[in-house]
Every structure is written in C-alpha cells, then in structure tokens.
C-alpha cells in the first residue's frame, strides 16, 4: 500500500485513538495465570483493538480479564465515548469529560488537567505520561474549554475548525458558532516525538506535522506523549483522518480528503481545505 | 493585604447549632474556599469545601449532614452553618482559600466549644 | 481515601538537614502539599505541588515527592523552623482533603 492510499482509508466512529483507553488495565496482555484451568475468557487486545476470546487458568492474572465479550466491550472500548461530535443545538459534554482521571500506568510523572464531574471543574492531576483516557488535557484553557460549562450551563464553547497556516492542518478551535464540519483528529497528532524514560530503543512511529507525514523513531519503552504508533499505518490512520460533518440528528458522515483544493460550504463560515 | 477574619465561635451545649462566618479582604473572593479544623492538642482536619460561585459542596463524612457550607460573593463572606453539635465538633475552625486544591491563605481560627 | 502517615516527632541540631516523611498509598502519584504551625498560629503552606516554594518562604525549605513518600527537607536548620509540619493531599474521587497526623520537629 503506498501512502497514498493509506491516506485515504475511512476510519469508522468506534476506532480507538492510539494509547488512549478507557481504563489502564485495558493495555494488559491476556495474563492466563500459574493455574491449570480451561476457562474461556475475554481480553482487550491493545494492538487489534477488539476484545478477543483467550483461555485462562483460573487464578491470578490480571484485570484485562472479562466474563463475557459485553463485559470486555463495556469496559474497554469506546463505541460511545470516542463520539464527541453532538448534535448543534444540545453542545453536551463530550462524554470522556466524566470519566475519572486516569494516571495510567507509566510513570513519568508531568502535570495535565482533567474534568471533576464531582466539582464541576476542571482541576490538575499528575498524568504518568501513557495510556489514561481522553479526559486528559495538556492546558486548564483546553479542559474548560472542551468540558466545563458556562454561565448558563452550555458548553463554554465547542469544537471547531481552523486551517492553520503555518502546516496546512487543521487543528480544533474554539468557535463561538455551532460548527457543522469537525475535524476528529487527536490533538495528540500535533505534538513532536518524544523517546521517553526508559533505556529501549523500540522501533516506533509518529506523525510529524509540519511535513504532514508518519515517521519513524526509537522510543525508549516508557513515558513518552500519545503521538506513538507501533506502526506507520496506525499512524496515518489516527493522525491523518478524514473530515466528520455534522447533520441534523446527530449522525455522522465521513467524508475523504481529496487532492485538489476543495471548497466546503459552512452554514455560518468558509474554510479551504488544501492538500492535507 | 489579603486576609481571612474568622468569627461566630463560641460555647454551645451538645445538639445545639453555631453559624461561623469568614470575611476576606485584600482580594476577591472568588475562589474555591474551605473550612478545616483542628482539636485541642490534635492535627489538622479538612471540614468542607465550596466552589467559586457556591455550586458545588462538599464535606467531610464526620460532618455530613450536620454542618452547611456557603457564600455570599457580594459580601466576600464564607459561612459554615453547624447544626447538631457533639462534642467532638470541639475545635479551632479556620477558613482557608485552595484555589489550586492546596491552602494558600489561612483565618487566624476561631474556637467552637461544644460542652455542656 | 487515602491514608498520610507521619512520624510524630523529628529532631535536628541547629545548622544540620531535617526531613520528615509522609507516606500513603501510590503518594507520589499525587500532588503533596507542607504546611508549617506555630503554636497558637494558623497553618502557613511551604510547598507546594511536590517541591515548590511559595513567595516569602525560605530557600532551606524543598519537597520532593515518588513512589509512597513525600519528604519535606529542611537544610540548615534554625531554630525558628521549630513548629508542627503537616503534610496533605487532595482526592479528586471524593473531593476531599487528607491531612497527615503531623510532625512536631525539634531544634536541639
């Protein structure tokens, strides 16, 4: 496959971001035990994403370890929480905005803020530096922004877009407006590599925005940032998606990028989209 | 300068009620403020919290349902209404702003004695 | 919630390193807090977040904070460092805040 037409691959709405879950012990491998029991049980595999059916020995293990594949699903996948976009009029939170904080399971200790559905508030907590979940942002403007209300109770604002200038991305934007066209991708996509804590030298990829293409580095096995891809096709699938426009009962359509310059209508505003 | 000015302590008999207030100056008020308590003798012991605009509120199990935290932004003014007073309520109460979840401005506490 | 654990008491020569330690359950996966009381005074905050120093607070006072353990360290110790230390953290869960049980620290 050339990149070309990676590119163009449409992503369905339950495809997981990489290293962002709902729960760490989601990221465990199948721990079958030191038993010697036959019992079939489920596991979230971290690398095709699904939950997946494998045979445990009936003691120990660990937590990635579900009676049924609802239960693994329930816990581990996010058919509703990666679904960000809601309809115009409602602005609801998006729904990662109640999950807990979620440290995650390295750690490289470094300050993010998160969404407290308890005190309604966005507050600070120390992020170990991988996996955690979507509720987990590196600015307090950026959590309140996206999860804290307003005065009178709507969201403070809600996602738009903007064509930004420097690297011909779009990257989420503040938009006083209710925006009909969206651009879903992680904003994780747009930090630079980072090798991390540790002393491994694992073969890794990620997504380089100023050229707008995946490349490869070494990652040293702990730590790190999100934009961290075991391969470069999960690469460019995460980082460069689609567009998801909005329609009128909340329903999505995804639409490919194409190469020619490209006019998209906007109800309230105009945007190019240019050889992304 | 920014301060914190506790008052409405005093002796009450068990199951009586008390309503402390904190007046702030020097700074507006706006943030998320707290009281915390301490017995004679003892530690420190977080009591209850309150958001900027007086939304949310929380409380120590111990106080549950007994004690009622509150404001008034337009006075600067932070209450704690305390209702069904034990003896163990017995302490220094002092009011503090933690606008980033740790104390930064303390009250000089005011003492609640609960005894009959 | 989570637990803080302080030793009760800690003594120092004038000039030499203090440190009290406060310990709970995966601590250094939150944010410590020191707070300094003088008897017959309110609390003052020393650090902050781990390790930092609010304005007006003597250099000598650091913090660190990993694993179970957060420690405060007091170098060159004087003899107006006398007083309780508590340590504290916040719970996001419950909203609320933990206190540990305090350390008298003693200039010798």
């Known amino acids: 496959d050339s990149e070309e037409d990676e590119e163009h691959t449409i992503i369905t709405d339950t495809e997981l971001p990489p290293l962002k879950l709902m729960h760490s012990f989601c990221a465990f491998k199948a721990d079958d035990g030191p038993c010697k029991a036959i019992m079939k049980r489920f596991f979230f595999n971290i690398f095709t994403r699904q939950c997946e059916e494998f045979i445990y020995g009936g003691c120990e293990g660990n937590q990635n370890r579900f009676e049924s594949l609802e239960e693994c699903k329930k816990m581990c996948t996010r058919d509703n929480a990666n679904r960000i976009i809601k309809t115009t009029l409602q602005q609801e939170k998006p729904d990662f905005c109640f999950l807990e904080e979620d440290p995650g399971i390295c750690r490289g200790y470094i300050t993010r803020y998160f969404y407290n559905n308890q005190t309604k508030q966005c507050e600070r907590f120390k992020y170990g530096g991988c996996l955690g979940n979507m509720n987990n942002f590196e600015t307090l403007e950026e959590c309140k922004n996206i999860c804290e209300d307003g005065p009178n109770g709507f969201q403070v604002d809600n996602y738009g877009t903007q064509l930004n200038a420097v690297n011909n991305s779009l990257t989420p934007q503040s938009t006083k407006v209710p925006s009909l066209f969206e651009f879903h991708g992680p904003s994780w996509c747009l930090t630079p590599a980072d090798r991390g804590l540790c002393r491994a030298n694992e073969n890794r990829f990620y997504y380089n925005s100023v050229i707008g293409k995946c490349r490869p580095f070494k990652y040293s096995g702990c730590g790190g940032n999100e934009n961290n891809f075991t391969s470069k096709q999960e690469c460019l699938r995460a980082c460069k998606k689609g567009f998801i426009q909005r329609i009128s009962k909340g329903g999505l359509i995804k639409t490919k990028r194409k190469r020619k310059k490209q006019r998209v209508k906007i109800a309230y505003e105009e945007i190019f989209v240019k050889n992304m | 300068q920014v301060q914190l000015v506790e008052s409405g302590g005093g002796l009450v008999q068990p199951g009586g009620s008390l309503r402390l207030s904190c007046a702030a100056s020097g700074f507006t008020f706006s943030s998320y403020a707290s009281w915390v308590r301490q017995a004679p003798g003892k530690g420190l012991e977080w009591v209850s919290g309150?958001?900027?605009?007086?939304?949310?509120?929380h409380y120590a199990d111990s106080v549950k349902g007994r004690f009622t935290i509150s404001r008034d932004n337009s006075k600067n003014t932070l209450y704690l209404q305390m209702n069904s007073l034990r003896a163990e309520d017995t302490a220094v109460y002092y009011c503090?702003?933690?606008?980033?979840?740790?104390?930064?401005?303390w009250g000089q506490g005011t003492l609640v004695t609960v005894s009959s | 919630d989570i637990e803080l654990t302080q030793p009760p008491s800690v003594s120092v020569a004038p000039g030499q390193t203090a440190r009290i330690s406060c310990s709970g359950d995966?601590?250094?996966?939150?944010?410590a807090h020191w707070y300094q009381q003088k008897p017959g005074q309110a609390p003052v905050l020393v650090i902050y977040?781990?390790?930092n120093r609010p304005s007006g607070i003597p250099e000598r006072f650091s913090g660190s904070n990993s694993g179970n353990t957060a420690t405060l360290t007091i170098s060159g110790t004087q003899a107006e460092d006398e007083a309780d230390y508590y340590c504290s953290t916040y719970t996001s869960r419950s909203h609320s805040y933990v206190f540990g049980g305090g350390t008298k620290l003693t200039v010798l």
């Open positions: 977040d781990d390790s």
């Open positions: 995966s601590l250094g996966s939150k944010f």
């Open positions: 503090a702003r933690y606008d980033n979840f740790y104390f930064d401005v």
């Open positions: 309150i958001s900027g605009d007086g939304s949310n509120t």
